[in-house]
């Protein structure tokens, strides 16, 4: 057959759907690869063809659109499963073509099993909400297009395995779930089960969102350097190991890039001829405030090293901070016996 523009396997779209639930999958060509939409392509005489490769097989085969109850069907640029089966897992290809043009893309579809508490291998979207903020709403995701607006589905919300009924600060309101003055205890997986009728059958859509309560913007601060500080002096003898921790607290700021670095005499450690090791560790609070520690160490410090200026720097979207470490050479008192001998004029 003639050449076809093959966009390959689009692993950016790792589509996961639950077993025994409806799934509608749009051909990614029109969303991410081509400049025109399905309607334009169709009116230009282009045809959309679907086929698939089963899991652990190499053979491409056509999709069977003649299954009982039209279990798999195509509608415009959407491939429908009503419902999915576990063995629908595989790589699906949509190809747009006519006699002179061809373009295709493949994408992986994974049909996932879930237990009665909605536990599964599904990757859930994460919704971050600010602690103590007035009201946060989450909406049952990815249910558009499954039923017409005239159909009013029933929606049940769960936290983990428990139906949300009489939760003090969490209120189900149809497709929305409202959180009033959220606390860290509101963290968890929230699942909406949407039930709707179609052609005399009831279908269920299960969607889970992970809620993570984070620090509020009103509490956002520039970095706070805990160490080094003015109270601690790093007093060392030449030949000893010098270890200076730079410990910095960053309040949670959405999409902030938190940085910590050392300078030695105004230069980055890589630009200094000193044998320096820097190790970094990070810990997080319950509201995703971050404590970042960079430990600077010099195995065998020289008198010259002890005269250098060691400065810890930190930066986030709120500002910058810096703090010099107090480093000095330990003064070794003269030994008493030698002093005494000199005092008596011994030779």
């Amino acid at each position: 057959s003639e050449r076809c523009d093959d966009w390959g396997l689009d692993t950016m779209r790792q589509i996961q759907v639950f077993e025994d639930e409806p799934a509608r999958i749009k051909c990614p060509l029109f969303e991410h690869f081509l400049k025109y939409n399905y309607s334009t392509a169709h009116s230009s005489g282009l045809t959309l063809i679907w086929y698939w490769t089963r899991q652990d097989r190499d053979l491409e085969e056509p999709i069977n659109f003649r299954l009982p109850e039209n279990r798999i069907s195509k509608e415009k640029d959407v491939l429908w499963f009503r419902p999915t089966l576990l063995n629908d897992t595989g790589n699906y290809t949509c190809m747009l073509r006519n006699t002179t043009y061809c373009s295709k893309v493949a994408f992986p579809l994974e049909v996932v099993q879930k237990d009665s508490c909605f536990n599964s291998a599904m990757r859930f979207p994460v919704h971050k909400m600010y602690i103590e903020h007035g009201i946060h709403k989450i909406t049952c995701p990815n249910v558009d297009g499954y039923f017409p607006s005239s159909v009013k589905p029933s929606v049940t919300w769960y936290k983990g395995c428990t139906e949300i009924v009489d939760f003090h600060n969490v209120l189900p309101e149809g497709m929305n779930l409202s959180f009033f003055i959220p606390l860290v205890s509101n963290n968890g997986n929230y699942t909406c089960v949407v039930t709707y009728p179609e052609n005399g059958r009831l279908f269920h859509l299960t969607r889970t969102v992970t809620v993570k309560v984070v620090g509020s913007p009103k509490d956002a601060l520039p970095p706070q350097i805990y160490s080094p500080n003015d109270r601690v002096v790093y007093e060392k003898e030449p030949g000893e190991e010098l270890v200076i921790p730079c410990k910095v607290y960053f309040s949670f700021i959405m999409d902030s890039h938190n940085e910590v670095w050392w300078t030695i005499d105004g230069k980055k450690p890589d630009d200094v001829t000193v044998d320096i090791t820097i190790n970094e560790s990070v810990s997080y609070s319950s509201t995703e405030d971050e404590t970042r520690t960079q430990i600077l160490s010099i195995k065998k410090v020289t008198p010259e090293d002890l005269r250098r200026n060691y400065v810890c720097h930190a930066r986030n979207t709120k500002g910058e901070a810096e703090q010099a470490a107090k480093v000095k050479q330990k003064v070794i008192p003269p030994r008493y016996t030698v002093e005494l001998a000199c005092g008596f004029g011994a030779t």
């Epitope: 007035g134 009201i135 606390l183 205890s185 509490d219």
Partner: antibody, heavy 118, light 107 residues
Framework: EVQLLESGGGLVQPGGSLRLSCAAS????????MSWVRQAPGKGLEWVSA????????LYADSVKGRFTISRDNSKNTLYLQMNSLRAEDTAVYYC???????????WGQGTLVTVSS | EIVMTQSPATLSVSPGERATLSCRAS??????LAWYQQKPGQAPRLLIY???TRATGIPARFSGSGSGTEFTLTISSLQSEDFAVYYC?????????FGQGTKVEIK
């Protein structure tokens, strides 16, 4: 210095209404959630209601839900509690308290006495 | 809602002695527990938050411990001004709830 000063308490008949106020000073009022906590004579403390720092989110104890309304005016640094359909069991000293998730109720007012009696 | 239970209801202690007050939650409240002191005719005062962190200006003789469901407030050497009612309170889940109080009285 953080200060919270309640006012508006008094004697009211069952079924009546009362509006409590709490004037705040010494801190950025709009950065803190606020609550009302009450204490019936000779009894323990009972949380009544809370409002978020932005005034959008409100919560109530089941015992007052539908009868009491908490609100705030951040421009006036003032917290309010509108109490309707008052009952004898609402008789208590009402305290306003500042709260943070990290530190709970860190500052309290001196309280105002509400007596519901015929 | 989470029920907080304090024991004992009353604790009789001599000045200079150690006092240990207990608080139990009906379900885990992590470390989101506070202790308050209340004297007659006064508003409660925050002593401890986060189960073990002393609030600003609270003397070192007050210490808190515990996490999950079991918590303790210890007053290492009772002073005359420490005789009062002490309340624990969880702020892990709404509604925030208080224990019924422990009265520390002079023996």
């Amino acid at each position: 210095e953080v200060q919270l000063l309640e006012s508006g308490g008094g004697l009211v008949q069952p079924g009546g209404s009362l509006r409590l106020s709490c004037a705040a000073s010494g801190f950025i009022f709009s950065h803190y959630g606020m609550s009302w906590v009450r204490q019936a004579p000779g009894k323990g403390l009972e949380w009544v209601s809370a409002i978020s720092y932005d005034g959008e989110g409100t919560l109530y104890a089941d015992s007052v839900k539908g009868r009491f309304t908490i609100s705030r005016d951040n421009s006036k640094n003032t917290l309010y509690l509108q109490m309707n359909s008052l009952r004898a069991e609402d008789t208590a000293v009402y305290y306003c308290a500042r709260f943070r998730y990290y530190t709970a109720f860190d500052y309290w007012g001196q309280g105002t006495l509400v007596t519901v009696s015929s | 809602e989470i029920v907080m239970t304090q024991s004992p209801a009353t604790l009789s202690v001599s000045p200079g002695e150690r006092a240990t007050l207990s608080c139990r939650a009906s379900q885990s409240v992590s470390s989101n527990l506070a202790w308050y002191q209340q004297k007659p005719g006064q508003a409660p005062r925050l002593l401890i938050y986060g189960a073990s962190t002393r609030a600003t200006g609270i003397p070192a003789r007050f210490s808190g411990s515990g996490s999950g469901t079991e918590f303790t407030l210890t007053i290492s050497s009772l002073q005359s001004e420490d005789f009062a009612v002490y309340y624990c309170q969880q702020y892990n889940n709404w509604p925030w709830t208080f224990g019924q109080g422990t009265k520390v009285e002079i023996k």
